[in-house]
């Protein structure tokens, strides 16, 4: 049975040329945690294997940095970056975790974070 | 140049044991997750193992589990594989991989036959 | 675990013909396909990585692509030294599983 949750950083917005951190935490399972995925809609940006480390899409590798953790850093961002992105957890024996985060990139200096969320 | 060589192959008995090695040269190795991938004769290709760069995290198909063993000796840019209580199946050449698989060894024969 | 299906286990061709090898996924692994070539005798050498991107040194005769499930290596104008086993793999999920290969021969 799957019990665990996925928190992650939920409704954000930032700035249009800023940075944004993309992060989330899976807990309340003792799965082993293999590989995490980040997908942007129908895009794989990057996999963050448990042993091999991280492999960053060559289409996004001058805007994406790996990390802090298993998160990842999204750089010079343009309005066109605005979208649903999926943080996938493949773990075992739990099998496959999904997190969702909406950013918004403004064109204003008016960006704040949105509150954190769950997804179970 | 990247280089892997890989050694200890041989032929054992069922129930038998080997160490494979690998020695990696021509770049960091304590910046790289390895692997070792098999290839049994006429067939295709196995990952069996990965490890962590530090080694602190590893990784074993289900299909060697409990027998086989992947460890690192960063100080000597080695790689190893511990294989106990060989079976027949697992009779292949068994190969030394880099990172995201981008260099390999040239491969090491492990026959297991009484 | 996901499945890699090459379907075809031989394929032939000519000098200079246009092949394409194909691979099919079990589940969508987007663009986490690398492709490997491996001649006689020899470890298989990655040629393509992330569906579509050509490692160190290998030739613009290659190249890959994806549409859905489907993964494709073509190779635009067969050389003679092209005659080998190609081998796809997903890396999206683990465990990261290859294709059962396919015999690139001269008819």
């Known amino acids: 049975m799957m019990t665990g949750t996925i928190e992650t950083t939920g409704n954000i917005s930032a700035e249009k040329g800023g940075s944004i951190i993309l992060q989330c935490h899976l807990s309340s399972t003792t799965a082993q945690v293999t590989q995490v995925n980040w997908e942007q809609q129908d895009q794989l940006l990057a996999i963050c294997n448990a042993d091999l480390g991280w492999h960053i899409s060559p289409s996004f590798k001058d805007r994406v940095a790996p990390g802090p953790g298993l998160g990842l850093t999204l750089q010079s961002l343009t309005v066109n970056d605005t979208g649903e992105y999926f943080c996938i957890y493949h773990t075992y024996p739990d099998g496959t975790y999904t997190g969702r985060i909406f950013l918004e990139v403004l064109e204003s200096s008016v960006a704040e974070h949105g509150a954190r969320f769950q997804i179970p | 140049e990247v280089q892997l060589v890989e050694s200890g192959g041989g032929l054992v008995q069922p129930g038998g044991s080997l160490r494979l090695s690998c020695a990696a040269s021509g770049f960091t190795f304590s910046s790289y997750g390895m692997s070792w991938v098999r290839q049994a004769p006429g067939k295709g290709l196995e990952l069996v193992a990965t490890?962590?760069?530090?080694?602190?995290?590893?990784n074993l198909a289900d299909s060697v589990k409990g027998r086989f063993t992947i460890s690192r000796d960063n100080s000597k840019n080695t790689l190893y594989l511990q294989m106990n209580s060989l079976r027949a199946e697992d009779t292949a050449v068994y190969y030394c991989v880099r990172g995201y698989f981008d260099y390999w060894g040239q491969g090491t024969t492990v026959t297991v036959s009484s | 675990d996901i499945v890699m299906t090459q379907s075809h286990k031989f394929m032939s061709t000519s000098v200079g013909d246009r092949v394409s090898i194909t691979c099919k996924a079990s589940?969508?692994?987007?663009?986490?396909v690398a492709w490997y070539q491996q001649k006689p005798g020899q470890s298989p050498k990655l040629l393509i990585y992330w569906s579509s991107t050509r490692h160190t040194g290998v030739p613009d005769r290659f190249t890959g692509s994806r549409s859905l499930t489907d993964h494709t290596l073509t190779i635009s104008s067969v050389q003679a030294e092209d005659l080998a086993l190609y081998y796809c793999q997903q890396y999206y999920s683990t465990p990261y599983t290859f294709g059962g290969g396919t015999k690139l021969e001269l008819k």
């Open positions: 589940q969508d692994v987007k663009t986490a």
């Open positions: 490890i962590k760069s530090s080694g602190g995290s590893t």
